[in-house]
């Protein structure tokens, strides 16, 4: 034991992340110690493989100790990057473990669970269109477009609640092509077009 040697301590802990599938990401970790500690990452108790183990890996252990993802990998069934991570710094005097950091993957599927259907109503009658956006995380918000332009939801006759678009009292000018839009941090998806026909 050399007098100036000291055990590792974490000086920068990783933070929780939410990242879009396919995007790069970094979980930061910085440790001090003498001799300079080695850093390893663990997810759910298993050591995380990096480019140090397999040159083809999409995860790189940076010289600083941070874990860099070239792209976040996340499929319908396989989700190797999502989870709770810790970094562990070690030297011959001991080890230090960082705080937990969760990496969540933001996704937005392509397929609408329910596309809106064509509706035909008489002037003055209520009209309802319904859609269920694609599955997503974070849960996608829903908006509507009419004839390619965002719907004016300041119109007191129009209510958007969940996936339902309700027009309490239809006018002839409400007729047109409606599209449901699901949006989250990944982007947006548009449903199939539904036609609202307003009869005199």
């Amino acid at each position: 034991l050399r007098q100036e040697d000291f055990p590792p301590r974490i000086v920068e802990h990783p933070s929780d992340l939410i990242v879009s599938k396919g995007e790069p990401a970094t979980l930061n970790c910085k440790a001090e110690g003498r001799p300079t500690p080695t850093i390893e990452w663990y997810k759910g108790g298993e050591r995380v493989e990096t480019d140090k183990d397999d040159p083809r890996s999409h995860r790189m252990l940076l010289p600083s100790g941070s874990l860099f993802f070239l792209r976040i990998v996340h499929g319908r069934k396989s989700r190797p990057d999502e989870g709770v991570y810790v970094c562990v710094a070690r030297n011959y005097l001991g080890e230090a473990v960082s705080h937990n950091a969760s990496l969540e993957v933001a996704i937005l599927r392509d397929d609408f669970r329910q596309n809106p259907s064509d509706v035909m109503v008489a002037v003055g009658e209520p009209a309802v269109m319904e859609c269920q956006p694609p599955r997503g995380h974070p849960e996608p918000t829903i908006s509507w477009k009419k004839d390619g332009s965002p719907l004016d939801d300041k119109d007191e006759r129009i209510t958007i609640r969940g996936g339902k678009l309700m027009i309490t009292y239809t006018r002839k000018s409400d007729a047109g092509k409606y599209v449901c839009v699901g949006t989250n941090m990944v982007g947006e998806r548009e449903s199939e077009v539904a036609e609202l026909t307003v009869l005199e």
């Epitope: 997810k43 759910g44 298993e46 995380v48 493989e49 183990d53 397999d54 990998v73 996340h74 499929g75 319908r76 069934k77 396989s78 989700r79 190797p80 990057d81 989870g83 392509d110 397929d111």
Partner: antibody
Framework: EVQLVQSGAEVKKPGASVKVSCKAS????????MHWVRQAPGQGLEWMGW????????KFPQKFQGRVTMTRDTSITTAYMDLSRLRSDDTAVYYC???????????WGQGTMVTVSS | DIVMTQSPSSLSASVGDRVTITCRAS??????LNWYQQKPGKAPKLLIY???SLQYGVPSRFSGSGSGTDFTLTISSLQPEDFATYYC???????FGGGTKVEIK
């Protein structure tokens, strides 16, 4: 190196069961779905189902429900496929395959030949 | 169940030829379509994932296209090592096409 290594060839009698193992190495076993695919002599590929190694949850096509069991042991990073009430038309090469995060089977085992004969 | 129909079931071609194999899904599968190559006595090998993305280490003469229900695998200039059987697979709910055997003319 990422690889899947399967157990050796088996010869079974009709009505018996067979258990094929698939040892995974070089990657985080719990992060990737594991599928089983079989191929009868001279025929195409037939999907048998998959297991989520994290949870142990399984899914099979209707054809194999009630006859196939898929399990895993995360402590030894090994997946298992058990097929019961064997018939002669179950004679095939059985493969395990890892499903990548891109929804494709990127790593395959070498295959296990199962012969069912009286 | 989603049925994958591959055509042709076999074809004869010469080295240097451009080869096209098609795969049709019985319902829309977006881009959840993969292509594999299999040689006798060997496990299948992933060539193309997500309809058009080339798997790491696969030669660029292989390409994939399509979306929805109709998909194509193209080998721009057939090489001697490309004589094999090719399978499409949909990963929306998982099933394989019947295969296309590419033989030497």
């Amino acid at each position: 190196e990422v690889q899947l290594v399967q157990s050796g060839a088996e010869v079974k009698k009709p009505g018996a069961s067979v258990k094929v193992s698939c040892k995974a190495s070089g990657y985080t076993f719990r992060g990737y779905a594991m599928h089983w695919v079989r191929q009868a002599p001279g025929q195409g590929l037939e999907w048998m189902g998959w297991i989520d190694p994290r949870t142990g949850l399984t899914k099979f096509p209707q054809k194999f429900q009630g006859r196939v069991t898929m399990t895993r042991d995360t402590s030894i990073t090994t997946a298992y496929m058990d097929l019961s009430r064997l018939r002669s038309d179950d004679t095939a090469v059985y493969y395990c395959a890892r499903e990548s995060g891109d929804d494709a089977f990127d790593i395959w085992g070498q295959g296990t030949m199962v012969t069912v004969s009286s | 169940d989603i049925v994958m129909t591959q055509s042709p079931s076999s074809l004869s071609a010469s080295v240097g030829d451009r080869v096209t194999i098609t795969c049709r899904a019985s319902q829309k599968i977006s881009s959840y379509l993969n292509w594999y190559q299999q040689k006798p006595g060997k496990a299948p090998k992933l060539l193309i994932y997500a309809a058009s993305s080339l798997q790491y280490g696969v030669p660029s003469r292989f390409s994939g296209s399509g979306s929805g229900t109709d998909f194509t695998l193209t080998i721009s200039s057939l090489q001697p090592e490309d004589f094999a059987t090719y399978y499409c697979q949909q990963s929306y709910s998982t099933s394989f096409g019947g295969g296309t055997k590419v033989e030497i003319k």
